[in-house]
Protein backbone atom coordinates (compact mmCIF):
# COMPACT_ATOMS: atom_id res chain seq x y z
CA UNK A 1 0.00 0.00 0.00
CA UNK A 2 0.98 3.64 -0.33
CA UNK A 3 1.73 5.97 2.58
CA UNK A 4 -1.08 8.37 3.42
CA UNK A 5 0.20 11.94 3.11
CA UNK A 6 -2.92 13.99 3.88
CA UNK A 7 -6.12 13.50 5.79
CA UNK A 8 -9.34 12.36 4.09
CA UNK A 9 -12.13 14.86 3.46
CA UNK A 10 -13.89 15.91 6.70
CA UNK A 11 -11.02 14.62 8.85
CA UNK A 12 -8.87 16.99 10.89
CA UNK A 13 -5.09 16.82 10.95
CA UNK A 14 -3.14 17.26 14.18
CA UNK A 15 0.44 16.21 14.93
CA UNK A 16 0.65 13.69 12.06
CA UNK A 17 -2.68 12.05 12.87
CA UNK A 18 -6.11 12.45 11.31
CA UNK A 19 -9.27 12.67 13.40
CA UNK A 20 -12.92 12.27 12.55
CA UNK A 21 -15.57 13.50 14.99
CA UNK A 22 -19.00 11.92 14.90
CA UNK A 23 -22.14 14.01 15.27
CA UNK A 24 -24.39 11.09 16.24
CA UNK A 25 -24.22 8.39 18.89
CA UNK A 26 -23.48 4.67 18.77
CA UNK A 27 -22.64 1.91 21.22
CA UNK A 28 -18.89 1.47 21.77
CA UNK A 29 -18.68 -1.70 19.64
CA UNK A 30 -20.50 -0.03 16.75
CA UNK A 31 -18.25 3.02 17.01
CA UNK A 32 -15.19 0.75 17.10
CA UNK A 33 -16.40 -1.05 14.00
CA UNK A 34 -17.14 2.21 12.19
CA UNK A 35 -13.56 3.38 12.70
CA UNK A 36 -12.13 0.06 11.57
CA UNK A 37 -14.16 0.22 8.37
CA UNK A 38 -12.54 3.62 7.77
CA UNK A 39 -9.08 2.02 8.12
CA UNK A 40 -8.78 3.82 11.46
CA UNK A 41 -9.37 3.17 15.16
CA UNK A 42 -11.17 4.82 18.04
CA UNK A 43 -9.00 7.64 19.33
CA UNK A 44 -6.02 6.68 21.47
CA UNK A 45 -4.92 9.52 23.74
CA UNK A 46 -1.19 9.50 24.42
CA UNK A 47 -0.47 13.02 25.71
CA UNK A 48 -1.92 16.19 27.15
CA UNK A 49 -1.41 17.76 23.74
CA UNK A 50 -3.70 15.20 22.13
CA UNK A 51 -6.16 15.33 25.03
CA UNK A 52 -6.52 19.11 24.66
CA UNK A 53 -7.00 18.88 20.90
CA UNK A 54 -9.71 16.24 21.10
CA UNK A 55 -11.35 17.87 24.11
CA UNK A 56 -11.85 21.14 22.27
CA UNK A 57 -13.33 19.56 19.17
CA UNK A 58 -15.80 17.30 20.94
CA UNK A 59 -17.05 20.00 23.29
CA UNK A 60 -18.81 19.14 26.56
CA UNK A 61 -20.33 15.90 25.23
CA UNK A 62 -19.84 12.28 26.31
CA UNK A 63 -17.65 10.70 23.63
CA UNK A 64 -16.18 7.22 23.26
CA UNK A 65 -12.43 6.65 22.98
CA UNK A 66 -10.45 3.52 22.12
CA UNK A 67 -9.98 2.27 25.67
CA UNK A 68 -11.80 -0.67 27.28
CA UNK A 69 -11.45 -3.46 29.82
CA UNK A 70 -13.97 -5.91 28.37
CA UNK A 71 -11.44 -8.73 28.62
CA UNK A 72 -10.07 -7.88 32.08
CA UNK A 73 -7.26 -5.30 32.06
CA UNK A 74 -7.64 -1.86 30.48
CA UNK A 75 -6.39 -1.87 26.89
CA UNK A 76 -6.01 0.66 24.10
CA UNK A 77 -7.37 -0.56 20.78
CA UNK A 78 -4.09 0.09 18.93
CA UNK A 79 -1.94 -1.78 21.46
CA UNK A 80 -0.54 1.30 23.20
CA UNK A 81 0.49 0.29 26.70
CA UNK A 82 -2.12 1.39 29.22
CA UNK A 83 -0.12 1.09 32.42
CA UNK A 84 2.72 3.37 31.35
CA UNK A 85 0.66 5.65 29.13
CA UNK A 86 -1.24 8.91 29.54
CA UNK A 87 -4.36 8.87 31.72
CA UNK A 88 -6.95 11.50 32.55
CA UNK A 89 -9.60 9.78 34.65
CA UNK A 90 -12.11 11.68 36.75
CA UNK A 91 -11.59 11.28 40.51
CA UNK A 92 -12.77 7.88 41.73
CA UNK A 93 -12.78 6.53 38.18
CA UNK A 94 -12.74 3.96 36.70
CA UNK A 95 -15.10 2.31 39.16
CA UNK A 96 -16.75 -0.51 37.15
CA UNK A 97 -20.07 0.56 38.68
CA UNK A 98 -22.79 -2.10 38.75
CA UNK A 99 -25.55 0.10 40.15
CA UNK A 100 -26.91 1.30 36.81
CA UNK A 101 -29.25 -1.67 36.54
CA UNK A 102 -28.31 -2.48 32.97
CA UNK A 103 -26.46 -5.66 33.81
CA UNK A 104 -22.71 -6.06 34.29
CA UNK A 105 -20.28 -3.31 35.11
CA UNK A 106 -18.68 -0.53 33.07
CA UNK A 107 -16.08 -1.62 30.55
CA UNK A 108 -15.66 1.23 28.06
CA UNK A 109 -14.01 4.62 28.54
CA UNK A 110 -15.37 7.96 27.35
CA UNK A 111 -14.61 11.65 27.58
CA UNK A 112 -17.01 13.40 29.96
CA UNK A 113 -18.34 16.95 29.70
CA UNK A 114 -15.12 18.39 31.17
CA UNK A 115 -12.81 16.19 29.10
CA UNK A 116 -11.79 13.86 31.89
CA UNK A 117 -12.44 10.15 31.47
CA UNK A 118 -15.08 7.84 32.93
CA UNK A 119 -15.89 4.19 32.45
CA UNK A 120 -19.46 3.45 31.39
CA UNK A 121 -21.76 0.78 30.01
CA UNK A 122 -20.52 -0.02 26.51
CA UNK A 123 -24.04 -0.11 25.08
CA UNK A 124 -24.68 3.58 25.71
CA UNK A 125 -25.03 5.54 22.45
CA UNK A 126 -22.30 8.14 22.75
CA UNK A 127 -20.51 10.13 20.07
CA UNK A 128 -17.06 8.89 19.11
CA UNK A 129 -13.76 9.95 17.57
CA UNK A 130 -11.79 7.97 14.97
CA UNK A 131 -8.05 8.38 14.54
CA UNK A 132 -5.59 7.23 11.92
CA UNK A 133 -1.90 7.96 11.60
CA UNK A 134 -0.75 9.92 8.57
CA UNK A 135 2.46 7.91 8.26
CA UNK A 136 0.84 4.51 8.16
CA UNK A 137 0.44 2.73 4.84
CA UNK A 138 -3.10 2.83 3.52
CA UNK A 139 -4.85 -0.40 2.57
CA UNK A 140 -5.60 0.82 -0.94
CA UNK A 141 -3.78 -1.08 -3.70
CA UNK A 142 -1.01 0.89 -5.38
CA UNK A 143 -1.77 2.63 -8.64
CA UNK A 144 -0.32 0.75 -11.60
Amino acid sequence: GSERTCCPVNWVEHERSCYWFSRSGKAWADADNYCRLEDAHLVVVTSWEEQKFVQHHIGPVNTWMGLHDQNGPWKWVDGTDYETGFKNWRPEQPDDWYGHGLGGGEDCAHFTDDGRWNDDVCQRPYRWVCETELDKASQEPPLL
Epitope: Q55, H57, G59, G115
Partner: antibody
Framework: QITLKESGPTLVKPTQTLTLTCTFS??????????VGWIRQPPGKALEWLAL???????RYSPSLKSRLTITKDTSKNQVVLTMTNMDPVDTATYYC??????????WGQGTLVTVSS | SYELTQPPSVSVSPGQTASITCSGD??????VCWYQQKPGQSPVLVIY???KRPSGIPERFSGSNSGNTATLTISGTQAMDEADYYC????????FGGGTKLTVL
Protein backbone atom coordinates in the same frame (compact mmCIF):
# COMPACT_ATOMS: atom_id res chain seq x y z
CA GLN B 1 -4.26 34.50 0.81
CA ILE B 2 -6.89 34.42 3.56
CA THR B 3 -9.04 37.51 4.05
CA LEU B 4 -12.13 38.22 6.13
CA LYS B 5 -14.34 41.29 6.15
CA GLU B 6 -17.12 42.23 8.55
CA SER B 7 -20.17 44.15 7.34
CA GLY B 8 -23.34 45.42 8.97
CA PRO B 9 -24.84 48.55 10.49
CA THR B 10 -22.58 51.03 12.23
CA LEU B 11 -25.41 52.37 14.39
CA VAL B 12 -28.22 50.45 16.07
CA LYS B 13 -30.82 51.54 18.58
CA PRO B 14 -31.23 49.96 22.02
CA THR B 15 -33.44 46.82 22.03
CA GLN B 16 -32.84 46.29 18.30
CA THR B 17 -31.23 43.19 16.79
CA LEU B 18 -27.75 43.43 15.30
CA THR B 19 -26.94 41.34 12.22
CA LEU B 20 -23.31 41.14 11.15
CA THR B 21 -21.94 39.28 8.14
CA CYS B 22 -18.41 37.93 7.76
CA THR B 23 -17.43 37.40 4.14
CA PHE B 24 -14.22 35.43 3.67
CA SER B 25 -11.93 34.10 0.99
CA UNK B 26 -8.87 31.88 0.81
CA UNK B 27 -10.38 28.97 2.75
CA UNK B 28 -13.46 26.78 2.74
CA UNK B 29 -15.79 26.24 5.67
CA UNK B 30 -16.26 22.66 4.47
CA UNK B 31 -12.68 21.67 5.30
CA UNK B 32 -12.18 19.56 8.42
CA UNK B 33 -11.01 21.57 11.41
CA UNK B 34 -11.91 24.95 9.94
CA UNK B 35 -14.19 27.42 11.68
CA VAL B 36 -15.11 31.08 11.92
CA GLY B 37 -15.50 32.97 15.19
CA TRP B 38 -16.73 36.35 16.32
CA ILE B 39 -14.93 38.50 18.87
CA ARG B 40 -15.70 42.02 20.06
CA GLN B 41 -13.74 44.78 21.74
CA PRO B 42 -15.37 47.76 23.45
CA PRO B 43 -13.39 51.01 23.03
CA GLY B 44 -10.26 50.88 25.20
CA LYS B 45 -11.16 47.48 26.64
CA ALA B 46 -10.24 43.82 26.26
CA LEU B 47 -11.21 41.27 23.63
CA GLU B 48 -14.36 39.25 24.32
CA TRP B 49 -15.21 36.04 22.51
CA LEU B 50 -18.82 35.77 21.33
CA ALA B 51 -19.43 32.70 19.19
CA LEU B 52 -17.91 30.29 16.68
CA UNK B 53 -19.07 27.78 14.10
CA UNK B 54 -17.13 24.85 12.66
CA UNK B 55 -17.08 23.00 9.35
CA UNK B 56 -19.36 20.31 10.82
CA UNK B 57 -22.04 22.80 12.01
CA UNK B 58 -20.81 22.62 15.60
CA UNK B 59 -21.77 25.92 17.24
CA ARG B 60 -20.27 27.33 20.45
CA TYR B 61 -21.39 30.44 22.33
CA SER B 62 -20.10 32.59 25.15
CA PRO B 63 -22.04 31.40 28.23
CA SER B 64 -22.82 34.96 29.34
CA LEU B 65 -24.30 35.96 25.96
CA LYS B 66 -25.66 32.63 24.69
CA SER B 67 -29.32 33.62 24.99
CA ARG B 68 -28.80 36.61 22.71
CA LEU B 69 -26.59 35.11 20.01
CA THR B 70 -27.11 33.03 16.89
CA ILE B 71 -24.37 32.06 14.45
CA THR B 72 -25.01 30.57 11.01
CA LYS B 73 -22.95 29.79 7.93
CA ASP B 74 -23.56 29.80 4.21
CA THR B 75 -20.75 27.79 2.64
CA SER B 76 -21.88 28.56 -0.91
CA LYS B 77 -21.47 32.30 -0.28
CA ASN B 78 -18.41 31.97 1.98
CA GLN B 79 -20.25 33.86 4.69
CA VAL B 80 -20.91 33.55 8.42
CA VAL B 81 -23.68 35.59 10.02
CA LEU B 82 -23.94 36.60 13.67
CA THR B 83 -27.16 37.96 15.13
CA MET B 84 -27.32 39.58 18.54
CA THR B 85 -30.67 40.50 20.03
CA ASN B 86 -31.71 43.18 22.49
CA MET B 87 -28.75 45.50 21.89
CA ASP B 88 -27.70 47.85 24.67
CA PRO B 89 -25.24 50.78 24.78
CA VAL B 90 -22.76 48.51 26.60
CA ASP B 91 -22.63 46.41 23.41
CA THR B 92 -20.89 49.29 21.63
CA ALA B 93 -17.67 47.74 20.33
CA THR B 94 -15.55 46.82 17.37
CA TYR B 95 -16.75 43.43 16.15
CA TYR B 96 -14.22 41.10 14.51
CA CYS B 97 -14.62 37.83 12.68
CA UNK B 98 -11.70 35.41 12.54
CA UNK B 99 -10.64 32.24 10.77
CA UNK B 100 -10.14 29.23 13.04
CA UNK B 101 -7.70 26.46 12.21
CA UNK B 102 -5.48 24.34 14.50
CA UNK B 103 -7.51 25.55 17.51
CA UNK B 104 -6.59 29.23 17.07
CA UNK B 105 -7.94 32.43 15.57
CA UNK B 106 -5.30 32.42 12.86
CA UNK B 107 -6.54 35.32 10.70
CA TRP B 108 -8.70 38.31 11.64
CA GLY B 109 -10.87 40.74 9.75
CA GLN B 110 -10.32 44.49 10.01
CA GLY B 111 -13.28 44.83 12.39
CA THR B 112 -16.38 46.97 12.24
CA LEU B 113 -17.36 49.51 14.88
CA VAL B 114 -20.95 49.17 16.04
CA THR B 115 -22.42 51.95 18.16
CA VAL B 116 -25.58 51.40 20.16
CA SER B 117 -27.39 54.65 20.82
CA SER B 118 -30.85 56.11 20.63
CA SER C 1 -17.46 31.00 34.18
CA TYR C 2 -13.77 30.47 33.46
CA GLU C 3 -11.47 33.47 33.94
CA LEU C 4 -7.94 34.30 32.82
CA THR C 5 -5.84 36.83 34.72
CA GLN C 6 -3.04 38.89 33.14
CA PRO C 7 -0.96 41.71 34.63
CA PRO C 8 -2.26 45.04 33.28
CA SER C 9 1.22 46.18 32.28
CA VAL C 10 4.77 44.95 31.82
CA SER C 11 7.83 47.09 31.09
CA VAL C 12 11.07 45.98 29.51
CA SER C 13 14.24 47.58 28.15
CA PRO C 14 15.17 47.03 24.50
CA GLY C 15 17.16 43.85 24.02
CA GLN C 16 15.96 42.38 27.32
CA THR C 17 13.52 39.51 27.85
CA ALA C 18 9.86 40.25 28.53
CA SER C 19 7.61 37.68 30.22
CA ILE C 20 3.84 38.06 30.26
CA THR C 21 1.86 35.64 32.39
CA CYS C 22 -1.68 34.35 32.13
CA SER C 23 -3.23 32.43 35.00
CA GLY C 24 -6.35 30.33 35.31
CA ASP C 25 -7.50 27.20 37.10
CA UNK C 26 -5.75 24.14 35.59
CA UNK C 27 -4.79 26.26 32.60
CA UNK C 28 -2.19 23.66 31.61
CA UNK C 29 -5.09 21.36 30.71
CA UNK C 30 -6.20 23.75 27.97
CA UNK C 31 -4.60 25.04 24.77
CA VAL C 32 -3.42 28.63 25.09
CA CYS C 33 -3.00 31.18 22.31
CA TRP C 34 -1.38 34.62 22.47
CA TYR C 35 -2.33 37.63 20.35
CA GLN C 36 -0.54 40.90 19.76
CA GLN C 37 -2.60 44.03 19.13
CA LYS C 38 -1.20 47.40 18.20
CA PRO C 39 -3.29 50.60 18.44
CA GLY C 40 -5.93 50.82 15.72
CA GLN C 41 -5.11 47.36 14.34
CA SER C 42 -6.67 43.91 14.48
CA PRO C 43 -5.09 41.30 16.76
CA VAL C 44 -2.36 39.08 15.33
CA LEU C 45 -1.77 35.50 16.47
CA VAL C 46 1.78 35.06 17.79
CA ILE C 47 1.55 31.72 19.66
CA TYR C 48 -0.96 28.87 19.37
CA UNK C 49 -1.33 25.46 21.00
CA UNK C 50 0.76 26.69 23.94
CA UNK C 51 4.09 27.00 22.13
CA LYS C 52 3.71 26.95 18.34
CA ARG C 53 4.60 29.97 16.21
CA PRO C 54 2.64 30.80 13.05
CA SER C 55 4.71 31.43 9.95
CA GLY C 56 6.00 34.97 9.85
CA ILE C 57 6.25 35.36 13.63
CA PRO C 58 9.85 35.98 14.78
CA GLU C 59 11.65 33.29 16.77
CA ARG C 60 12.02 35.68 19.70
CA PHE C 61 8.38 34.90 20.57
CA SER C 62 7.91 31.70 22.57
CA GLY C 63 5.26 30.23 24.83
CA SER C 64 4.85 27.72 27.63
CA ASN C 65 1.91 26.41 29.60
CA SER C 66 1.79 24.20 32.69
CA GLY C 67 -0.04 24.04 35.98
CA ASN C 68 -2.12 27.17 36.37
CA THR C 69 0.08 29.53 34.36
CA ALA C 70 0.89 30.17 30.72
CA THR C 71 3.76 32.47 29.79
CA LEU C 72 4.56 34.44 26.67
CA THR C 73 8.27 35.19 26.46
CA ILE C 74 9.78 37.76 24.11
CA SER C 75 13.55 37.53 24.03
CA GLY C 76 15.61 40.41 22.69
CA THR C 77 12.58 42.68 22.87
CA GLN C 78 12.38 45.35 20.20
CA ALA C 79 10.55 48.69 20.11
CA MET C 80 8.20 47.24 17.51
CA ASP C 81 7.02 44.67 20.10
CA GLU C 82 5.30 47.39 22.13
CA ALA C 83 1.62 46.46 22.05
CA ASP C 84 -1.24 44.91 23.99
CA TYR C 85 -0.99 41.13 24.42
CA TYR C 86 -3.97 38.86 25.08
CA CYS C 87 -3.94 35.24 26.16
CA UNK C 88 -6.77 32.96 25.19
CA UNK C 89 -7.68 29.53 26.55
CA UNK C 90 -9.47 26.92 24.47
CA UNK C 91 -11.59 24.30 26.15
CA UNK C 92 -15.00 23.26 24.86
CA UNK C 93 -15.45 26.99 24.27
CA UNK C 94 -12.91 29.80 24.67
CA UNK C 95 -12.12 32.91 26.71
CA PHE C 96 -9.67 35.83 26.57
CA GLY C 97 -7.59 37.34 29.32
CA GLY C 98 -7.87 41.02 30.20
CA GLY C 99 -4.77 41.96 28.22
CA THR C 100 -1.29 43.21 29.13
CA LYS C 101 0.22 46.44 27.84
CA LEU C 102 3.88 45.83 27.02
CA THR C 103 6.00 48.97 27.18
CA VAL C 104 9.51 48.98 25.72
CA LEU C 105 11.38 51.64 27.65
Amino acid sequence: QITLKESGPTLVKPTQTLTLTCTFSGFSLTTGGVGVGWIRQPPGKALEWLALIYWNDDERYSPSLKSRLTITKDTSKNQVVLTMTNMDPVDTATYYCAHIIAVAFQHWGQGTLVTVSS
Amino acid sequence: SYELTQPPSVSVSPGQTASITCSGDKLGHKFVCWYQQKPGQSPVLVIYQDRKRPSGIPERFSGSNSGNTATLTISGTQAMDEADYYCQAWDSSTVFGGGTKLTVL
